[in-house]
């Protein structure tokens, strides 16, 4: 019988708003009061097993006590009503859970999308956390027809996919209702034609066809999504070369209505391009489709668009009446080769004499020429045709080169080694830049490049290393042959020397010492040596530092103390810092030469 509760709490299952006030009443049953000899004065209220102060209780009558909470801040409160029985023992009467939270906010930013082939999905911003189970219902209707409600799932409470087929060209009204135990609110209604919310499927079966007639075009074809039968489509077509990471885009106005092919123009010959395409409703209302799968194609070959860079070297040891000439040229970059290079054609014509033809697969040709003047031409050939000819005059043996470039400078900038000069007054056909690494250990192996006759500033297009000394030579080339070369040294990036100078004494006197050293080998300089510093000290004295110009290889220390041990070392400095050489010791004599104690 006593398993029957001794009383009850009202309300039974309260849900209250956070930070609001709440009053609960515990009512004791007569039979319980009689059994335990108690009344409402004996009631003890507890929350989460902690006793509530008596000041919060109100005795309503002999059977009922209430407790009031102000500003409820907990989401879940276990409230129990207990009575103090014989010997101050607590007996539980009843317990409830006070659940607190917030009413729903009005849903905002309601928007819908119709992914082609799927049903309409709408999403919204549900507002703040309510801490209560809040149900969101998407409602929709035509002017003449109500559709079934779409109840958002618990795991995706701010979106819902309707269960009915989308009908285009008929306006639909859509809104969201949010409801929990504390209230119900409705979003603003939105009214739209679903055709303006379409996200089409991407075009598929994209393929690329090249043209033998035009090496600058590729034709794209694709299959449109089915929705083309309902709406007019517009497209974005993007393309890039195979190795590029950024996309170029066809002007949108060229693809502003439904089509299933497009010819892309102004492309580079014999280049692989990657394409992708997407579509949307032509008036821009709705959503872009995802991008199609990429498709690639190669433009057809065209004849090489440029003659190769062309130069020569003459073997200094030449036989009487003949000289060995090495003709050299550069491979055209793909964007100028415009196809697979098959071979090179060289012609050599002795001045006003007969012509010799050579077909070469390499990028050099060594020939024995007489001491006369020669005219050399070079063309490069691919499947489609030949390039224009590069022409080079190899002057006679007694030719005197003149008219060098002036004010030659070389300097690093933006991780490149730049060369600039003042152009000669004479008309220059082209410039040849040659460079090599100066080293004490290896010969200077030359690389070269050609620049147009209008150029007076360029950078070296080789694989340059830091802290190496480059000897750069610029030769202007005129119609009748090369001008005088001019040279300059430069570094891509300097570093401190790898070694410091080794200092030694040349002569030591009572009060002075002549120090000498060797210039640092170029391989350890790592930059231009700007100056030296000599550091010297006695065992007990302070160190003295003397700066010495980098052109010197000896220096005299004066005002030294006689009969004293000196420690000396030397540092060499580039623009990027210095490096000390080994320490060297010497002792000044007690007496000068011929001096007696």
């Amino acid at each position: 019988e006593l398993l029957d509760p001794c009383g009850y709490i009202s309300p039974e299952s309260p849900v209250v708003q956070l930070h609001s006030n709440f009053t609960a009443v515990c009512v004791l049953k007569e039979k319980c009061m009689d059994y335990f000899h108690v009344n409402a004065n004996y009631i003890v209220w507890k929350t989460n097993h902690f006793t509530i102060p008596k000041e919060q209780y109100t005795i309503i009558n002999r059977t009922a006590s209430s407790v009031t909470f102000t500003d409820i801040a907990s989401l879940n409160i276990q409230l129990t009503c207990n009575i103090l029985t014989f010997g101050q023992l607590e007996q539980n009467v009843y317990g409830i859970t006070i659940i607190s939270g917030l009413p729903p906010e009005k849903p905002k930013n309601l928007s819908c999308i119709v992914n082609e082939g799927k049903k309409m999905r709408c999403e919204w911003d549900g507002g703040r956390e309510t801490h209560l189970e809040t149900n969101f219902t998407l409602k929709s209707e035509w002017a003449t027809h109500k559709f079934a409600d779409c109840k958002a799932k618990r795991d995706t409470p701010t979106s819902c996919t309707v269960d009915y087929s989308t009908v285009y060209f008929v306006n639909i009204e859509v809104w969201v209702e949010a409801e929990n135990a504390l209230g119900k609110v409705t979003s603003d209604h939105i009214n739209f034609d679903p055709v303006y919310k379409v996200k089409p499927n991407p075009p598929h079966n994209l393929s690329v066809i090249n043209s033998e007639e035009l090496s600058s075009i590729l034709k794209l074809t694709w299959t449109n999504p089915s929705i083309k039968s309902v709406i007019i489509l517009k497209y974005n077509i993007q393309y890039r070369t195979k190795d590029a990471s950024t996309w170029s885009q066809i002007p949108p106005e060229d693809t502003a209505s439904t089509r299933s092919s497009f010819t892309v123009q102004d492309l580079k010959p014999f280049t692989e391009y990657v394409f992708r395409i997407r579509c949307m409703k032509e008036d821009g209302k709705g959503y872009w489709s995802d991008w199609s799968e990429e498709a690639s194609g190669i433009t057809y070959e065209d004849r090489p668009s440029k003659a190769p860079s062309f130069w020569y070297k003459i073997d200094p040891s030449h036989t009487q009446g003949y000289r060995t000439v090495q003709l050299v040229w550069k491979t055209l970059p793909p964007f100028e080769a415009n196809g697979k290079i098959l071979d090179y054609e060289v012609t050599l014509t002795r001045w006003k004499s007969h012509l010799q033809n050579y077909t070469v697969n390499a990028t050099k040709l060594t020939v024995n020429l007489t001491n006369d003047r020669y005219l050399a031409t070079l063309t490069v050939r691919n499947l489609v045709g030949k390039s224009d000819a590069a022409v080079l005059t190899i002057p006679a043996c007694d030719f005197q080169a003149t008219h060098p470039v002036m004010d030659l400078k070389a300097f690093p900038k933006d991780n490149m080694l730049w060369v600039e000069w003042t152009t000669p007054r004479e008309s220059v056909k082209k410039y040849i830049l040659e460079w090599c690494v100066l080293s004490d250990k290896a010969p200077c192996i030359t690389d070269w490049q050609q620049e147009d006759g209008t150029v007076h500033r360029t950078y070296l297009r080789g694989n340059l290393a830091e802290s190496k000394c480059y000897l750069i030579t610029v030769t202007p080339v005129y119609a009748d042959g090369p001008g005088s070369p001019e040279s300059i040294k430069a570094y891509l990036k300097q570093a401190p020397p790898s070694k410091g100078p080794t200092v030694r004494t040349k002569k030591v006197g009572k009060n002075e010492a002549v120090l000498e050293w060797d210039q640092l080998p170029v391989d350890v300089q790592n930059g231009f040596i700007r100056n030296y510093t000599i550091f010297y000290r006695t065992i007990i004295g302070n160190e003295t530092a003397v700066n010495v110009d980098s052109s010197h290889t000896e220096y005299t220390l004066s005002s030294l103390t006689s009969d004293t041990l000196y420690m000396v070392r030397m540092a060499a400095y580039t623009d990027e810092g210095g490096k000390d050489g080994p320490e060297f010791t010497f002792t000044t004599p007690k007496f000068a030469q011929g001096e007696i104690e």
Epitope: E116, S165, V167, Y168, F169, V170, I227, V230
Partner: antibody, heavy 128, light 108 residues
Framework: QVQLQESGPGLVKPSETLSLTCTVS????????WTWIRQPPGKGLEWIGH???????NYNPSLKSRVTISVDTSKNQFSLKLTSVTAADTAVYYC??????????????????????WGQGTTVTVSS | DIQMTQSPSSLSASVGDRVTITCRAS??????LNWYQQKPGKAPKLLIY???SLQSGVPSRFSGSGSGTDFTLTISSLQPEDFATYYC??????????FGQGTRLEIK
């Protein structure tokens, strides 16, 4: 109450062009497809094609090469032209209204509504 | 083209009878089928659209059902004015729209 009225010659010579006009009264031409349907004597209904108020057309593939449907919104009229007619084109020609509404089912599309307003029909005989 | 086949081609019934006409599509047309009634010398009249939606002003004794390929028009209690020819029509948006060959409903 929207009403449709077909008009045009009742007799057309073979190889000539059949031209009919449908006048829409009592309502707007906007927001509908305007349809032509024909019914040869003693036979069933054949859809010829339709046009929207914006001028988008759809034709029966079997007649496409010979049919043109056009709309004149200022006159609240739409027209049918059928070229190179033969005796097989003899029929009652109806114009009808089809409310806009295309239902999407996966990637298939259907006219949601039916042709809800029809003209009374005009008989066209092709004969020399 | 989607072919529509109605059965029966004709049938005789009496006033008060329950009548069923069926229509079969050669491929699935979801629920996009319309029913029309045509009386001699008159234009067709829309009864049912989207397989089961009753057109405004049409008596409730007419009803439609079905989806996919098989559809039914039912007249629950035949009235004298219901004797006519009935056509089904599929409304697939890719041309052409096609009609069934018709079912002639006669008085027994």
């Amino acid at each position: 109450q929207v009403q449709l009225q077909e008009s045009g010659p009742g007799l057309v010579k073979p190889s000539e062009t059949l031209s009919l006009t449908c006048t829409v009264s009592g309502g707007s031409i906007s927001n509908y497809y305007w349809t032509w349907i024909r019914q040869p004597p003693g036979k069933g209904l054949e859809w010829i094609g339709h046009i929207s108020n914006s001028g988008t057309t759809n034709y029966n593939p079997s007649l496409k090469s010979r049919v043109t449907i056009s709309v004149d919104t200022s006159k609240n009229q739409f027209s049918l032209k059928l070229t190179s007619v033969t005796a097989a084109d003899t029929a009652v020609y109806y114009c009808a209204r089809l409310p806009l509404g295309i239902a999407a089912v996966d990637t298939d599309y259907y006219y949601y509504f039916g042709m809800d307003v029809w003209g009374q029909g005009t008989t066209v005989t092709v004969s020399s | 083209d989607i072919q529509m086949t109605q059965s029966p081609s004709s049938l005789s019934a009496s006033v008060g009878d329950r009548v069923t006409i069926t229509c079969r599509a050669s491929q699935s047309i979801s629920s996009y089928l319309n029913w029309y009634q045509q009386k001699p010398g008159k234009a067709p009249k829309l009864l049912i659209y989207a397989a089961s939606s009753l057109q405004s002003g049409v008596p409730s004794r007419f009803s439609g059902s079905g989806s996919g390929t098989d559809f039914t028009l039912t007249i629950s209690s035949l009235q004298p004015e219901d004797f006519a020819t009935y056509y089904c029509q599929q409304s697939y948006s890719t041309p052409p729209i096609t009609f069934g060959q018709g079912t002639r409903l006669e008085i027994k």
